[in-house]
Amino acid sequence: EVEKTACPSGKKAREIDESLIFYKKWELEACVDAALLATQMDRVNAIPFTYEQLDVLKHKLDELYPQGYPESVIQHLGYLFLKMSPEDIRKWNVTSLETLKALLEVNKGHEMSPQVATLIDRFVKGRGQLDKDTLDTLTAFYPGYLCSLSPEELSSVPPSSIWAVRPQDLDTCDPRQLDVLYPKARLAFQNMNGSEYFVKIQSFLGGAPTEDLKALSQQNVSMDLATFMKLRTDAVLPLTVAEVQKLLGPHVEGLKAEERHRPVRDWILRQRQDDLDTLGLGLQGGIPNGYLVLDLSMQEALS
């Protein structure tokens, strides 16, 4: 806490300018009017204040706005944003995407801090849903943003926002998150033709059910092995050898290299060996010819 001391004669700040960098902390406290600071926040960023001086400026704003800063001030915080705590940010009401962008720019190139996470949470909650423009902005700054949301939060993403999602934005999403996102993507891309549809939907297929994979197998999509390996095991298991062959097209040869890994391993265990042999890949571990499988779930448990 800076002591309350009178401003020396002739030092009263008339505007926020570079002369203030020569002020001691107590002089800044005594000589800079908080209301002046608030109206000229846009100048602060251009002045090379020390961290200690920024602490004083923050303190002045806190005193002026104990209930939280107005958006006109927030938009121009610049590097002062790095001084804010999550508790400070929870008091804010940020509605402008421009304000959000300005503050994200300050943190650019760094990991998502607790302050940024709180800011984004406040902004999204204020908007009511994660619209396309917001998602565009957030994924541009943080490609992993979408996958940092819980499945519950992803449920409130409208299908129209899915157009903003790039494949790399889904890299760290888990099956449960993709399970929520996939139906939205299916809805968003439903009017596209076969090949274009597959290009767009491919990144979301980790959430696809068996019936959708069967439908894709009829469309000559040539799914790559990396995508196949991310499919839900329970969705892959019911697929026949012929369906997997059609689904993968020329990439079917890659099954051999993945035969010990899920979901390929589990899928092999559910297929008849003579069906697997038709692929000519030397895949082993299917149900021996002549065996009658009465309970596939038992077969899975035994494996």
Epitope: C147, S150, P151, E152, S155, S156, D174, P175, P183
Partner: antibody, heavy 118, light 113 residues
Framework: EVQLVESGGGLIQPGGSLRLSCAVS????????MTWVRQAPGKGLEWVSV???????YYADSVKGRFTISRDNSKNTLYLQMNSLRAEDTAVYYC????????????WGQGTLVTVSS | DIVMTQSPDSLAVSLGERATINCKSS????????????LAWYQQKPGQPPKLLIY???TRESGVPDRFSGSGSGTDFTLTISSLQAEDVAVYYC?????????FGQGTKVEIK
Amino acid sequence: EVQLVESGGGLIQPGGSLRLSCAVSGFTVSSKFMTWVRQAPGKGLEWVSVIYSGGKTYYADSVKGRFTISRDNSKNTLYLQMNSLRAEDTAVYYCARDSGGWGYFDYWGQGTLVTVSS
Amino acid sequence: DIVMTQSPDSLAVSLGERATINCKSSQSVLYSSNNKNYLAWYQQKPGQPPKLLIYWASTRESGVPDRFSGSGSGTDFTLTISSLQAEDVAVYYCQQYYSTPPTFGQGTKVEIK
């Protein structure tokens, strides 16, 4: 304060039907992923069913085709409709809130006992 | 389905002593893309519903005493009670939420010696 209160349990004959209710307060049931978990007398916990906030549902293989999970948003209540009941369905049934939809459960009701016996 | 196996089935520990419960999954519950272990621990006292203690294998739920800690990765996990208190007498369950259906261990009963 978050509260989940189950009701609807009781003694029922094999082949019969029962509907369990879970009255929720402290949050809106439609905004959360909600789950039923059961526990046979003296035994461990078994997951039964989930309903996503978006409405998608999943069931354990042991109850698929017999049980239906649903919710009434206006009453802020979760349901489990249980048909073709079997002796092995005898258990305390808990409704639980799935934390963020990740699959672990941060709030549980006190449970309601379902006994299937002739 | 992923099978969860706890050991021991029961455990008697003196007050103030350390209690250790192990949980093993039939396949890894570590999701490599986000480096998270999809494992939770619950405590259940007689006549009560389970109570969440730990999630993501090592994150303590709000309000849970810091004598409870979770560790491990992949297929092998441990719940440790650093200094057993009388109120810790209960059955403890591990649970994976890596894949649907979520599955629980058979439980470990902790008693006072």
